[in-house]
């Protein structure tokens, strides 16, 4: 036969801990029920009565089994350079991530605090390393025999076309121009694009309190703007 289940509130056996979804109330010296996600403790337990829980109000949440007196405030609305990848509900905080064409320059525990536009490589420079959700594009000068004539965060340096007779030699920012006779072959018939990073999030990402509402959340120091890398242009 299974052991008799104690109903909350109850005094725990010496040396034992309260069960899952319960907490030890120091005042009552009893194991008491926690409130489920989406709720908070409206009335704390006593020796004779269990915790009374109430639903979180609009724009507030609790994501864990808890006994907090007030629900946490959801984070502020996402800025124009962000997309809301998780809505504020009674059980989860809002999560904002960067929209396509931007990357997260200053992250927080979940989502992004500050988004920045992906660097664009100017003519004569191509993408050496594409941008990601959390890192900027890295540009590099086009090597001899290659060029880029665009201002782009995705275009790489492309080989010059090879001419039978060269009218104008190519350089880092311009393709070779052939005389009216067609080139023997065109190494680069069109612009080569690198895929844009897409701001996504893990399907299971859990929300967290904003620093202002959670005393133990680590704070990130604000970072000043960094100068653009050589061959890049800020937009």
């Amino acid at each position: 036969l299974p052991a008799q289940v104690a109903f909350t509130p109850y005094a725990p056996e010496p040396g034992s801990t309260c069960r899952l979804r319960e907490y030890y109330d120091q005042t009552a010296q009893m194991c008491c029920s926690k409130c489920s996600p989406g709720q908070h403790a409206k009335v704390f337990c006593t020796k004779t009565s269990d915790t009374v829980c109430d639903s979180c109000e609009d724009s507030t949440y609790t994501q864990l089994w808890n006994w907090v007196p007030e629900c946490l405030s959801c984070g502020s609305r996402c800025s124009s350079d962000q997309v809301e990848t998780q809505a504020c509900t009674r059980e989860q905080n809002r999560i904002c991530t960067c929209r396509p064409g931007w990357y997260c320059a200053l992250s927080k525990q979940e989502g992004c605090r500050l988004c920045a536009p992906l660097r664009k490589c100017r003519p004569g420079f191509g993408v050496a390393r594409p941008g990601t959700e959390t890192s900027d594009v890295v540009c590099k000068p086009c090597a001899p025999g290659t060029f880029s004539n665009t201002t782009s965060s995705t275009d790489i340096c492309r080989p010059h076309q090879i001419c039978n007779v060269v009218a104008i030699p190519g350089n880092a920012s311009m393709d070779a121009v052939c005389t009216s006779t067609s080139p023997t072959r065109s190494m680069a018939p069109g612009a080569v694009h690198l895929p844009q990073p897409v701001s996504t999030r893990s399907q299971h990402t859990q929300p967290t309190p904003e620093p202002s509402t959670a005393p133990s959340t680590s704070f990130l120091l604000p970072m000043g703007p960094s100068p653009p890398a050589e061959g890049s242009t800020g937009d």
């Epitope: 299974p2 959670a214 133990s216």
Partner: antibody, heavy 119, light 107 residues
Framework: QVQLLESGGGLVQPGGSLRLSCAAS????????MTWVRQAPGKGLEWVSA????????FYADSVKGRFTISRDNSKNTLYLQMNSLRAEDTAVYYC????????????WGQGTLVTVSS | DIQMTQSPSSLSASVGDRVTITCQAS??????LNWYQQKPGKAPKLLIY???TLETGVPSRFSGSGSGTDFTFTISSLQPEDIATYYC?????????FGQGTKVEIK
């Protein structure tokens, strides 16, 4: 994105010790309970130990009680499992997992680290 | 300790088939039951929690039901990517216990 990365596994002799680490990122580590689950080669999942968000409460399976110690360093976002007096039957892949709601719902898992106890 | 008995231990089904796995607890655990999927060489993945709630991002062909001691996990239309071992886990009380697993294969 949430990431859990275990390390510290390896080959150890019976009676020896090993300390496993689990580096957490992408979430507020100090607000979540954490757990260790192991899986012996070709076998099922076995819960090993759990720890509350602050580290104040710890729980153990009978099979490891008195030999294993779970702990956490919230300043380093790291979970630990100190394993002493190791036995052959402790050979397993050890996973750390996050308890998503503080109610033994393991919503994120690491990739695991293999511990082999053999002479 | 709460024992979790899962059945069958393995099954073979065709693509498109309905697959059902059962899990029985040795005592009442209310709806505190989770289901996980584990593919070979990978970590387990949470599919269903609180007996019937689908985890975010999990395909709707997976479902769960039950309360008390008897629980059921269903794949409504088996897909090739569903080849894995499935585990139930009680989250009612410590020590946490898992079922022994059900290995699902394609015929």
């Amino acid at each position: 994105q949430v990431q859990l990365l275990e390390s510290g596994g390896g080959l150890v002799q019976p009676g020896g010790s090993l300390r496993l680490s689990c580096a957490a990122s992408g979430f507020t580590f100090n607000t979540y309970a954490m757990t260790w689950v192991r899986q012996a080669p070709g076998k099922g999942l076995e819960w090993v130990s759990a720890i509350s968000d602050s580290g104040g409460d710890t729980f153990y399976a009978d099979s490891v009680k008195g030999r294993f110690t779970i702990s956490r360093d919230n300043s380093k976002n790291t979970l630990y499992l100190q394993m002493n007096s190791l036995r052959a039957e402790d050979t397993a892949v050890y996973y750390c997992a996050r308890d998503g709601t503080y109610a033994a719902r393991f919503d994120y898992w690491g990739q695991g680290t293999l511990v082999t106890v053999s002479s | 300790d709460i024992q979790m008995t899962q059945s069958p231990s393995s099954l073979s089904a065709s693509v498109g088939d309905r697959v059902t796995i059962t899990c029985q607890a040795s005592q009442d655990i209310s709806n505190y039951l989770n289901w996980y999927q584990q593919k070979p060489g990978k970590a387990p993945k949470l599919l269903i929690y609180d007996a019937s709630t689908l985890e975010t991002g999990v395909p709707s062909r997976f479902s769960g039901s039950g309360s008390g001691t008897d629980f059921t996990f269903t794949i409504s239309s088996l897909q090739p990517e569903d080849i894995a071992t499935y585990y139930c886990q009680q989250s009612d009380s410590f020590p946490i216990t898992f079922g022994q697993g059900t290995k699902v294969e394609i015929k």
